[in-house]
């Protein structure tokens, strides 16, 4: 089989008739040197996933459900290639599972127990999979066979499909339970029309269900989604208040050497030619012989998905943990309202350091898990391998369009009431070395740069973000002549100027020299023209602060600050002469940890805050000799967000707008996977 | 209440060995692990190796690989075994566990 051939999985005699057809027509229309298909057939989609894990096929469609199959080891698959639906202008890859119920019904997803339910169908993936599987650890026990706990934890159901003789109750609100359109509360639109009725309390849909069924806003108003946070939410916010954000068909192929780049090189190349409206010969999206044979008949073309996204990045941890649940069957010992352990994330060996100390000294409260840079910790706290940890506002931005929530935040000024007053942020500046007395912020071309990391807010979404305005291109690392920016690409002449030794130069943590507020400042004392910190940098850094042997002889006059308007100002004018203002570093979680986080941290603080006088002899949660791990060293504490509880909120739509600007310069492969998750 | 007894250290030349101990008087000793710390002079004391609960070690950079921190709950001791010592590593150590004051605390001096 020559390189260049995707071979696709077929699981029926007709899918492998479309299969030869796919493969004879795309022979037809692509040059010789392109990707072509060859067929293999097997008996089902789990013997589909088995063979493209073991190299005999390379590429399989599959539902939401298998895509969990395929991605458990041993298989180890991962979606390369969506299907969408609706428009090319408004892609589809989407639906959302929902809990729909009547306005004036007044309960939340945690008192659903005695409640009468309406389900599309047993076992169908909105309507009793993500539901069931989320509700799994509220059922009474024994929890098998699933049906009878279900039906002793609502009142009454209709689920269809159930078997009506041993689970009575699970037909209770639709005598017979048919399987079929025959059973008026069949399927989306019958287990929609069961709560309209009265007969049920709430119904298990997804979210496109109360638009097909309900034209007239006057009439949706009077219905509320259910939000796994135990809020409500009007139907049209299905995006912020769902129990999962479900794929509908994927293509999926091996992790490693899985030809993901010639599949879609396929595919693209398919949908260009025997896409929607495009061939009467053949069609891509139709099934004379069947139905939705390789692809689903009803969608319109694929999109690639981002390399960063793993399976259990693509499906979502609600989804994960409802699927998980049900196939597993496994819940704590008694679900108790005490708080599980916060699982922190700790970047590179100092900072697990750090964070294994706090570990052994919060007698169990916190847990430490390590990542190599703060995207992957933010992956991590996604998928619940972690829980939390504290981040600079450009990746706030990046954690909130990944669905976190920040929680708490750093305060860096001393107060009366500091764990209520959040602060409005500190302040983004450009340093340089006084003796460098020609250097202006209008001057900055050719020069070299020293940035605390790729994607941080004083380091660079300030700066470059005001630079690309001025410059209108992304090519920051023509625009100086060397620098260094961990996290930039390592071939970077924005690498060049990095200390890290082998693998660890540029890379965006502490293995890095240059890494950080600190090291941004290193960088410049050692080699650099320029250093974007935070005001407080040089002061910290100076006058004996940080016993280092490169800094132990620094001096804060040495210094200047570069203003926007071409002049420069003393150290200590930062109020006066600064890029802007940027939002304090926030912690950030999952909107389920959310209340135990704060709780949590509140506690750890009041053991191990600023009210620890003695660093020397008892951890002190917000020292690290100027190192930064885990939370800045001049954090005097946590406090409370109050209402700015979104990463909107917190940051600001100034903030958020800037970064947003930016986004066309960004290499951010995380960001990039959840803006396809939720664009 | 639990008190804590580091003993073992002593002045070793470059290259040699030590192993230091840290006994703890009372019930419920090391249950959410145990840290060895060490403080050279004019410095500020920093933390070496810990041992969780669990068996989970870790170490501060500059000693991996050299130093090897280990338990035995039956009698209520964590050691510290300390090889290729370099006269970095001069200081004075000490173990902790949570709620439990630091000790004397052992010297260790390494002679180039």
């Known amino acids: 089989v020559p390189d260049k051939t995707v071979r696709w999985c077929a699981v029926s005699e007709h899918e492998a008739t479309k299969c030869q057809s796919f493969r004879d027509h795309m022979k037809s229309v692509i040059p010789s040197d392109g990707p072509s298909v060859a067929c293999v057939k097997k008996a089902s989609y789990l013997d589909c996933i088995r063979a493209i894990a073991a190299n005999e096929a390379d590429a399989v469609t599959l539902d939401a459900g298998l895509v969990y199959d395929a991605y458990l080891a041993p298989n180890n698959l991962k979606p390369v290639v969506a299907e969408f639906y609706g428009s090319k202008e408004d892609p589809q890859t989407f639906y959302y599972a929902v809990a729909v119920v009547k306005k004036d019904s007044g309960f939340q997803m945690n008192q659903l127990r005695g409640k009468k339910s309406c389900h599309t169908g047993l076992g169908r993936s909105a309507g009793w999979n993500i539901p069931i599987g989320l509700l799994y650890c509220d059922l009474p026990e024994p929890r098998k066979p699933l049906e009878k706990a279900v039906a002793n934890f609502f009142s009454g159901s209709c689920a269809p499909c159930a078997d009506g003789t041993d689970f009575p109750q699970l037909c209770q609100l639709c005598p017979g339970c048919g399987c079929s359109t025959l059973n008026q509360y069949f399927g989306y639109s019958g287990a929609f029309k069961c709560l309209k009725d009265g007969a049920g309390d709430v119904a298990f849909v997804k979210h496109s269900t109360i638009f097909e069924n309900l034209a007239n806003k006057a009439d949706r108003d009077q219905y509320e989604l259910l939000c796994l946070d135990n809020t409500r939410k009007p139907v049209d916010e299905y995006k912020d208040c769902h129990l999962a954000q479900v794929p509908s068909h994927t293509v999926v192929a091996r992790s490693m050497g899985g030809k993901e780049d010639l599949i879609w090189e396929l595919l693209n190349q398919a949908q260009e030619h025997f896409g929607k409206d495009k061939s009467k010969e053949f069609q891509l999206f139709s099934s004379p012989h069947g139905k939705d044979l390789l692809f689903k008949d009803s969608a319109h073309g694929f999109l690639k998905v981002p390399p960063r996204m793993d399976a259990k990045m693509y499906l979502g941890y609600e989804y994960v943990t409802a699927i998980r649940n049900l196939r597993e069957g496994t819940c704590p010992e008694a679900p108790t309202d005490e708080c599980k352990p916060v699982k922190w994330c700790a970047l590179s060996h100092h900072e697990r350091l750090k964070c294994d100390e706090w570990s052994v000294n919060s007698v169990g409260k916190i847990e430490c898990v390590s990542a190599e840079t703060t995207e992957d910790c933010i992956a991590k706290i996604m998928n619940g391998e972690a829980d939390a940890m504290s981040l600079d506002g450009g990746f706030v931005y990046i954690a909130g369009k990944c669905g976190l929530v920040p929680v708490l935040a750093e305060n860096y000024n001393k107060s009366d009431n500091c764990e209520d007053t959040p602060e409005a942020g500190y302040f983004a500046i450009a340093v340089v070395k006084k003796s460098a007395s020609d250097l202006t912020w209008d001057n900055l071309k050719g020069k070299k740069s020293c940035h605390t990391a790729v994607g941080r807010t004083a380091g660079w979404n300030i700066p470059m973000g005001l630079l690309y305005n001025k410059i209108n291109h992304c090519r920051f690392d023509e625009f100086f002549s060397e620098g260094c920016a961990p996290g930039s690409k390592k071939d970077s002449s924005l690498c060049k100027l990095c200390m890290g030794s082998g693998l660890n130069l540029c890379e965006p943590n502490n293995k890095e020299g240059y890494y950080g507020y600190t090291g941004a400042f290193r960088c410049l004392v050692e080699k650099g023209d320029v250093a974007f910190v935070k005001h407080q940098t040089v002061p910290q850094n100076t006058g004996g602060k940080n016993p280092d042997p490169w800094a132990k002889n620094l001096n804060e006059k040495d210094y200047e600050l570069l203003c926007l308007d071409g002049t420069r100002k003393p150290v200590e004018e930062y109020a006066n002469c600064h890029l802007a203002r940027a939002p304090n570093h926030a912690v950030v979680t999952r909107k389920d940890k959310e209340a135990c986080v704060h709780k949590i941290l509140r506690q750890q603080q009041h053991l191990f805050g600023s009210n620890v006088t003695d660093c020397s002899g008892n951890f002190c949660l917000f020292r690290s000799e100027t190192k930064d791990l885990l939370f800045r060293d001049d954090t005097v504490c946590l406090a409370k967000l109050h209402d700015r509880n979104t990463y909107e909120k917190y940051l600001g739509e100034e903030y958020v707008k800037a970064v947003g600007n930016l986004r066309k310069c960004s290499t951010s492969s995380l960001l990039e996977a959840c803006t396809f998750r939720r664009p | 209440e639990v008190q804590l007894v580091e003993c073992g250290g002593g002045l070793v030349q470059a290259g040699g060995s030590l192993r230091l101990s840290c006994v703890a008087s009372?019930?419920?000793?090391?249950?959410?692990?145990v840290i060895w710390y060490r403080q050279a002079p004019g410095k500020q004391r920093e933390l070496v190796a810990l041992?969780?609960?669990?068996?989970?070690?870790n170490y501060r950079e500059s000693v991996k690989g050299r130093f090897t921190i280990s338990r035995d709950d039956a009698k209520n001791t964590v050691w510290l075994q300390m090889n290729a010592l370099e006269p970095e590593d001069t200081g004075v150590y000490y173990c902790k566990t949570p709620g439990v004051p630091f000790g004397q605390g052992t010297q260790v001096t390494v002679s180039s």
């Open positions: 041992i969780k609960s669990d068996g989970y070690t």
């Open positions: 009372g019930s419920g000793f090391g249950i959410n692990g």
